[in-house]
């Protein structure tokens, strides 16, 4: 029977409350991470003047942060679903070491830094289920990651602040590009 207007629907609603589709879940997971990044960026920008700094290039030389390029097939021109998906997963795996670096970089947002890291791991799992060509995904070498982490942590305070800012900015850009691409799939 129809639900009387204004009353909460019980039996009528139940069949419609299906779980989120894989695409809906991935979309929401990315936006969840982006929300966390915006909170972390707020703390970074409030704490230092890195967000207005013009000296980013100095620190960027130390970093090899994943970026989307034309060849990755994620842009509207030359879009390629499988190539793009491999790039997104590979990029996220490469970002993991940088997210680990962020873990001790926040005072008031420590839990949020952890949530971003954990949510990213979950996102990678969702995307790996979606990918057909898992063999094409290269996993970063743990030894290389460990030495990179040591190197980043040994930087002076200014460089560490700049590195934090650059990681957050790059990760945000990478996720935004990924979100646009995934919405086309």
């Amino acid at each position: 029977a129809p639900v009387p207007p204004g009353e909460d629907s019980k039996d009528v609603a139940a069949p419609h409350r299906q779980p989120l589709t894989s695409s809906e879940r991935i979309d929401k997971q990315i936006r969840y991470i982006l929300d966390g990044i915006s909170a972390l960026r707020k703390e970074t920008c409030n704490k230092s003047n890195m967000c207005e700094s013009s000296k980013e290039a100095l620190a960027e030389n130390n970093l090899n942060l994943p970026k989307m390029a034309e060849k990755d097939g994620c842009f509207q021109s030359g879009f390629n679903e499988e190539t793009c998906l491999v790039k997104i997963i590979t990029g996220l795996l490469e970002f993991e070491v940088y997210l680990e670096y962020l873990q001790n970089r926040f005072e008031s947002s420590e839990e949020q830094a952890r949530a971003v890291q954990m949510s990213t791991k979950v996102l990678i799992q969702f995307l790996q289920k979606k990918a057909k060509n898992l063999d094409a995904i290269t996993t970063p070498d743990p030894t290389t990651n460990a030495s990179l982490l040591t190197k980043l942590q040994a930087q002076n305070q200014w460089l560490q602040d700049m590195t934090t800012h650059l990681i957050l900015r790059s990760f945000k850009e990478f996720l935004q590009s990924s979100l646009r691409a995934l919405r086309q799939m």
């Epitope: 779980p19 989120l20 879940r25 929401k28 997971q29 936006r31 969840y32 982006l34 929300d35 966390g36 915006s38 909170a39 949020q112 949530a115 954990m118 949510s119 979950v122 969702f126």
Partner: nanobody, 116 residues
Framework: EVQLVESGGGVVQPGGSLRLSCAAS????????MGWYRQAPGKQRELVAD???????EYADSVKGRFTISRDNAKNTVYLQMNSLRPEDTALYYC??????????WGQGTLVTVSS
């Protein structure tokens, strides 16, 4: 046990307003993304609006500028203020919660009817 309890649905004339509420229990509300979905008879479910722990929001194009989602972490409640309602907004509206591990939960739904 997770519970999402919606209220505020009803019959309203075109151009009118309604405010939906969803009270959550059994989840760590402050770390959950909260959203409203709707489903009209014979149509696909669609995301109306969602709001994340630090306040980022997203709206369906069809409701932008008319609907506003907000949350009160102290009351474990999410709201959907719906203004300038149209007949095409008639649907069952569901509250939805989503946590960073990818777990999600649904309310039972509340009916919104826009009719003259």
């Amino acid at each position: 046990e997770v519970q999402l309890v919606e209220s505020g649905g009803g019959v309203v004339q075109p151009g009118g307003s309604l405010r939906l509420s969803c009270a959550a229990s059994g989840i760590i509300f402050s770390i959950n993304a909260m959203g409203w979905y709707r489903q009209a008879p014979g149509k696909q479910r669609e995301l109306v609006a969602d709001i994340f722990p630090f306040g980022s929001t997203e709206y369906a194009d069809s409701v932008k500028g008319r609907f506003t989602i907000s949350r009160d972490n102290a009351k474990n409640t999410v709201y959907l203020q719906m203004n300038s309602l149209r007949p095409e907004d008639t649907a069952l509206y569901y509250c939805h919660s989503y946590d960073p591990r990818g777990d999600d939960y649904w309310g039972q739904g509340t009916l919104v009817t826009v009719s003259s």
